[in-house]
Interface confidence: medium
Amino acid sequence: THLGIRLPLRSGLAGPPLGLRLPRETDEESEEPGRRGSFVEMVDNLRGKSGQGYYVEMTVGSPPQTLNILVDTGSSNFAVGAAPHPFLHRYYQRQLSSTYRDLRKGVYVPYTQGKWEGELGTDLVSIPHGPNVTVRANIAAITESDKFFINGSNWEGILGLAYAEIARPDDSLEPFFDSLVKQTHIPNIFSLQLCGAGFPLNQTEALASVGGSMIIGGIDHSLYTGRLWYTPIRREWYYEVIIVRVEINGQDLKMDCKEYNYDKSIVDSGTTNLRLPKKVFEAAVKSIKAASSTEKFPDGFWLGEQLVCWQAGTTPWNIFPVISLYLMGEVTNQSFRITILPQQYLRPVEDVATSQDDCYKFAVSQSSTGTVMGAVIMEGFYVVFDRARKRIGFAVSACHVHDEFRTAAVEGPFVTADMEDCGYNIPQTDESTLMTGRA
C-alpha cells in the first residue's frame, strides 16, 4: 500500500470500563522472543515528514548503494526506484551491482491513486542502523510509476513488512523480513516507535521533522512506558487484528462489533490516518462533534477538506475527546484498550494561505476497506510485531505527544464476551484488491 495525503500524568479518561474490570496482571511480561533490552544501534533509525511516512536507510547491491526506504506494514514487497524520476534524488542502479540477479519477471502494482511497475530481481541488502547482517532479498526495481513517489519526501523505495499472502505478483515472492529471518539468527519479531511532530512544520523544519525507531529482532524497553499488551494477529496477510469496542471519551459507540472490523482491521505504518468503515466513521464523528461542542467547526473539517487553526500555542486540546479502541486480548474473553489523544488525531499542517497560526487536519477518515490503524494510532504507541507468536503488542510510546492533563494509554484487562464474533469473514473470492489511497 501507499501513503495518501496517500505518515512522558493523569489519563483524563471518562466513563466506566467495559464490563467487569479484572485484577491487574503483573507487570512482568511473558518471555519475549529474541533479544531484549537495548538495541542502541537501532534507536532513532527512522526519519520522515508528517504525513509522508517514516523511512529507514538501507543499502542494496555490491558495492552498497544507499537508499531511504519507507517502512510499510501494510504491504509485502521490497520495491525501490530503479530509474530516473523527477522526485528521486537517487535510485538503485542494478548495472553497478555485481551481486544483482535478474529474476526475468515483471511486477505491476496498481493503486487507487497511481501505480508502480518494475522488474523482479534479487540482491544483497543490509540496514546500516539495524542488525549487522547482509541478506539476499527479492527486490522490485521500479522502472515506471505514477503518483507513487512523493515530491520532497526523501524516500526512494518501500519496505513491505507484511506477509507473503499479499505480495505481488503472488505469494511465492518471499518478503524481505521472511528472507532476513530465514538467512540469519534474527528472531521473527520487529517493533516500531513512530514519533509524530506534534506541531506544524514550516518548509525548513519539515526537512527532519519526525523520527522514530524500527527495532529488528526484538523489543527495546527504553522506547515505552508501562507494560505491553498483546492482541492476536487474526490472519497472516496484512497485520489483521480484531477491535471489539470503540469509545469516545469513555462513551461506547454501541455498534455491533463486526462493524468495527468490516471488512478487516489492520495496523499499517504506511497510512497516515486512522481510517474507519463508513458507519463507524459517521458514528465516531457524531460523538467527537458532541464532545467538542464548545467550539463549532465547519463540516469540511470533519470531512478532511478544511483545517482548523488557532493562534500559535493556543490549541484547546482539552475540548477534544480521547478515542479508545478495545482490542481482543490473548486470553479468552479478555480485551485491552488503547487510547489516543487529539494530539494524535489532529495532524499539524501548514495552512497554504497563512503560516501565522497552528493549523490541523482531522486525521480520522472514512474507509471502504475496513479499519486502518495508521500513523495517527501508531504515533501514540510502541508497537511490537511479534510474528513468531502471531501477535501485536501495544505499549505507551516514550515519545508520544501529550499535554499535562492527559496521556495516551494502554490499559486492561477488561472482560469482553464473544470477541470471535467481531471478526468479519471475507467471502472467499480471489483476494486481489490492493488497499490503497492511504490518507
Epitope: 465547519p298 477538506e305 495552512d351 477518515s365 489511497g437
Partner: antibody, heavy 120, light 108 residues
Framework: QVQLVQSGAEVKKPGSSVKVSCKAS????????ISWVRQAPGQGLEWMGN????????NYAQKFQGRVTITADESTSTAYMELSSLRSEDTAVYYC?????????????WGQGTMVTVSS | EIVMTQSPATLSVSPGERATLSCRAS??????LAWYQQKPGQAPRLLIY???TRATGIPARFSGSGSGTEFTLTISSLQSEDFAVYYC??????????FGGGTKVEIK
C-alpha cells in the same frame, strides 16, 4: 500553478445523461476537494456537490441527490460530474472548482466551464 | 440549509466611487464566508475568504468584513474592471455550500 481544464460543450436530449470531466494539472489532486457549481443562463451560482478524491464518497446538495454522480479518477487527476434524467432547466454552464489545504473551503481555482444545453 | 441573501440585487456606481455590498446568512457561519467576482462569459474568481482575507493577487481596494450572519464587501474606489457580478458563499456547512443570489455592480 494548478489548472482545471473541463471537457467541451454538450447538447443533450431531455431524459438523457451528460458526463462532464475536469482535469487537474500542476498540483496535488487527491487531497483537495473538487466542487461542481452550475449557472443557468442569466442566473446565479448553484453548488451541486463535491468530492475529496482520497476520501472517496461525494457529498451532494439535496436538490440533486439521486440525479448527480460525482467521481474522481486519481490516476488521471480527473473529476467527473454526471447528471441524469436531464430536463430543459438543466441547461447551464457547469463549473468545477478546487478547494482545500486551508482553514476555509474557498474555491480558489476554477475550470473554464462547460456549457450543457438540454433541448429536444 | 443555510440561506444566503445578498443586497442590493443591482448597485449603480460611478467609477472612482465606493461600493458596499451586503450578504446575510440565515444562521451564523462564523467567519466561514467567501466573496467571488464574475464577469460575463468568465468563470468566477475568488476575491475574499475567511470573511476578510484577500486572495492572492486581489487589489487592496477590495475588503471584506463581518462575522456570524452579516457580511460586507467594500470596493473603495471602483475601477472600470470592477463592474461585474459579486457572489458570497458560506463555507460553514455542506452539503450544500450555498451561494447568495449575487449583486450586479453596474456603471451609473
Amino acid at each position: 500553478q494548478v489548472q482545471l481544464v473541463q471537457s467541451g460543450a454538450e447538447v443533450k436530449k431531455p431524459g438523457s445523461s451528460v458526463k462532464v470531466s475536469c482535469k487537474a494539472s500542476g498540483g496535488t489532486f487527491s487531497s483537495y476537494a473538487i466542487s461542481w457549481v452550475r449557472q443557468a443562463p442569466g442566473q446565479g451560482l448553484e453548488w451541486m456537490g463535491n468530492i475529496i478524491p482520497i476520501f472517496g464518497p461525494a457529498n451532494y446538495a439535496q436538490k440533486f441527490q439521486g440525479r448527480v454522480t460525482i467521481t474522481a479518477d486519481e490516476s488521471t487527476s480527473t473529476a467527473y460530474m454526471e447528471l441524469s434524467s436531464l430536463r430543459s432547466e438543466d441547461t447551464a454552464v457547469y463549473y468545477c472548482a478546487r478547494s482545500g489545504g486551508t482553514k476555509y473551503g474557498m474555491l480558489d481555482v476554477w475550470g473554464q466551464g462547460t456549457m450543457v444545453t438540454v433541448s429536444s | 440549509e443555510i440561506v444566503m441573501t445578498q443586497s442590493p440585487a443591482t448597485l449603480s456606481v460611478s467609477p472612482g466611487e465606493r461600493a458596499t455590498l451586503s450578504c446575510r446568512a440565515s444562521q451564523s457561519v462564523g467567519s466561514n464566508l467567501a466573496w467571488y467576482q464574475q464577469k460575463p462569459g468568465q468563470a468566477p474568481r475568488l476575491l475574499i475568504y475567511g470573511a476578510s482575507t484577500r486572495a492572492t493577487g486581489i487589489p487592496a481596494r477590495f475588503s471584506g468584513s463581518g462575522s456570524g450572519t452579516e457580511f460586507t464587501l467594500t470596493i473603495s474606489s471602483l475601477q472600470s474592471e470592477d463592474f461585474a457580478v459579486y457572489y458570497c458563499q458560506q463555507l460553514y456547512t455542506w452539503p450544500p455550500r450555498t451561494f447568495g443570489g449575487g449583486t450586479k455592480v453596474e456603471i451609473k
